[in-house]
């Protein structure tokens, strides 16, 4: 009985042609949606003139279907028991699951104006950039449509730079027709306890973004884990969205469409300051904004974004220190709505349901030489949007799963 099931599981979770795992791995059978909530700034002039608190009002959800494309360039390497691939990116707007259209407008931070003095911390160049910002009539805030903000728009200020630079700006630009990877993962053929664990990403075993062990690529991509998951296990996974490896711990047992699953959650200490969690010391890469590494709940991923001042957090600054959220009004963090979780079927290690929640923020600092920013009296980590990416096993697949896996065990 049990030995036969274990043998079957070990055979079927291997990532090679013909297995159950491989078929679902190449192209997920789960419909994955990414919902966006945009933080619409209510008092842009007051902030730019008086350095007031930024009043935001979230608007959403605006929903896109994502992860519907099959993995490409799948290549097995029998020598080291790995399989490599790229994951194509694509997003299709779902009007019926959205509160408005892609043409809805929002007042948000001017991404280029905020980023330019951060990238060019040179007073001479800032004077030059100020001339361009003024000429283009750009200011600290801008009004952009959802489509522009997410997927890119031609920035009028950057368009004046008389050199061949990229003038398109967008939170996720470029996205459509791009790929994530190359990933190289263990196929589990020689050792099932390594199945789906990432061996390398973009040809490297480290990210080159963080010092020390923070730079390691740990675990899987969170779509599955090695089988026979125990509650005591810490699930480690790498997320290219946040440019780091992270982990989840057991939270509770859940019944998902008749399938018993373990809900693993991202613990608060994953976002803690080095003061609270010494393991996080290497995620604190600058001392000023982080108040000498005492702030928590935000991750500076600038090194991973060509030096742009991008900070990742949980939505509404959940689990973030008061100094981070204090300059922003209108945030209401809520554990249930804003945490990330993975519902993992413990026998196979397959993630059957998940909710990945994160917030994209941009740092804007006072800049004496740039008129649009010269009245600021303090730096702000400005929330731009938050997203909720969810997937749940379909009813048909759930029935099949019960028949083939959990039913047999019962």
């Amino acid at each position: 009985g049990d030995m036969l099931i274990e043998k079957t599981i070990k055979r079927e979770v291997v990532l090679e042609e013909g297995t159950t795992a491989f078929k679902n791995w190449v192209k997920t059978g789960t419909t994955v949606y990414r919902q966006f909530w945009i933080f619409d700034v209510q008092n842009p002039d007051d902030v730019a003139k008086n350095s007031s608190k930024i009043k935001v009002k979230q608007r959403g959800p605006y929903t896109y279907r994502v992860r519907y494309l099959a993995k490409e360039n799948i290549t097995q390497d029998p020598e080291d028991h790995t399989v490599s691939f790229v994951q194509p990116n694509g997003a299709i707007f779902e009007p019926s699951l959205s509160v408005g259209t892609e043409d809805d407008n929002f007042t948000v931070l001017n991404l280029a104006v905020a980023a330019a003095p951060h990238i060019y911390q040179n007073s001479f160049v800032q004077v030059v950039l100020n001339s361009l910002i003024k000429k283009s009539k750009s200011s600290m805030f801008q009004t952009r449509s959802l489509k522009e903000l997410l997927w890119g728009y031609k920035d009028p200020f950057l368009s004046l730079v008389p050199y061949p630079i990229s003038t398109t700006v967008g939170v996720f630009y470029p996205y459509n027709d791009t790929v994530d990877g190359v990933y190289k993962v263990f196929n589990g053929k020689d050792n099932i306890s390594k199945v789906a664990i990432i061996e390398s990403y973009k040809g490297k075993r480290n990210l080159s973004y963080w010092p020390s062990y923070c730079d390691m690529i740990n675990g899987t991509d969170a779509a599955s884990f090695p089988p026979f998951v125990e509650k005591s296990r810490t699930l480690r996974f790498f997320s290219s969205d946040i440019c780091r490896s992270i982990y989840a711990v057991f939270g509770s047992e859940i019944d998902l469409k008749g399938i018993p699953v373990y809900r693993f959650v991202l613990p608060a200490n994953a976002f803690a300051s080095p003061l609270q969690n010494p393991d996080n010391h290497c995620f604190c890469t600058e001392k000023v904004i982080s108040n000498n590494c005492t702030s928590y709940g935000v991750l500076d991923i600038g090194k991973c974004k060509e030096g742009k001042p991008v900070y990742i957090s949980l939505p509404h600054f959940l689990h973030a220190s008061p100094d981070v959220s204090e300059p922003i009004e209108g945030l209401h963090p809520n554990e249930d709505e804003h945490r990330t979780y993975l519902d993992v079927e413990p026998i196979t290690g397959f993630t059957l349901q998940f909710a990945k929640r994160l917030q994209v923020n941009i740092l804007v600092k006072p800049a004496r030489k740039i008129e649009a920013l010269k009245n600021l009296k303090r730096p702000y980590i400005v929330p731009i949007l938050w997203l909720n990416e969810t997937g749940t096993i379909g009813d048909e697949k759930a029935e099949m799963f019960k028949t083939q896996v959990t039913g047999k065990i019962k």
């Epitope: 040179n122 001479f124 160049v125 004077v127 030059v128 001339s131 000429k135 004046l160 008389p162």
Partner: antibody, heavy 117, light 107 residues
């Protein structure tokens, strides 16, 4: 092809005035801004004045502040340096130069200004 | 104002020699340093920007290094056409300032 051509140099008495011109071709001065840099005989290079892009602000070395004025006529793609109250120590070859990020990638051939009685 | 101090003020070298010119800024200018070559009666020519970035068309025997306050221009194998005066310049803060120059002469 990018080119800068200075003109207007010559001999002038102390206290006198002179206007130098810098005609640009192959790029628009509006987009880059223009600098003037001078070199006294047998000496090193000294930055003098700058007009930032798009009719932006103007900046001057302390040694010429209040006496020299930089300007540009974008329709002619030409920059000017109006030099008043000239002194013997202003004697130099004056170069106009193109810069965006603060280094000078193109220079004119220079025009000699001699201040002497 | 940021002072740029170049050394030596002059040097004698032979064709094929490796030549090093240094430049020290009076305060941190990160990597915002350019190097120029000037021949008598001619305008300066840009060699290097951002301390290390070779300008297009400049021979690869020229290289720049350094960041913060200390910078170096190296000519790996001196050629006859390299005998000239070399200037460093900081492009970090206005006013833009130059070093006093280093004259490279034939030994």
């Amino acid at each position: 092809e990018v080119q800068l051509v200075e003109s207007g140099g010559g001999l002038v008495q102390p206290g006198g005035s002179l206007r130098l011109s810098c005609a640009a071709s192959g790029f628009t001065i509006d987009a880059f801004g223009i600098h003037w840099v001078r070199q006294a005989p047998g000496k090193g290079l000294e930055w003098v004045a700058w007009i930032a892009p798009y009719g932006g602000d103007t900046y001057y070395a302390d040694s010429v502040k209040g006496r020299f004025t930089i300007s540009a006529d974008t329709s002619k793609n030409t920059a000017y340096l109006q030099m008043n109250s000239l002194r013997a120590e202003d004697t130099a070859v004056y170069y106009c130069a193109r810069s965006f990020f603060g280094y000078f990638d193109y220079w004119g051939q220079g025009t000699l200004v001699t201040v002497s009685s | 104002d940021i002072q740029m101090t170049q050394s030596p003020s002059s040097l004698s070298a032979s064709v094929g020699d490796r030549v090093t010119i240094t430049c020290r800024a009076s305060q941190d200018v990160s990597n915002w340093v350019a190097w120029y070559q000037q021949k008598p009666g001619k305008a300066p020519k840009l060699l290097i920007s951002y301390a290390t970035s070779l300008y297009s068309g400049v021979p690869s025997r020229f290289s720049g290094s350094g960041s913060g306050t200390d910078f170096t221009l190296t000519i790996s194998s001196l050629q006859p056409e390299d005998f000239a005066t070399y200037y460093c310049q900081q492009h970090s803060n206005a006013p833009l300032t130059f070093g006093q120059g280093t004259k490279v002469e034939i030994k």
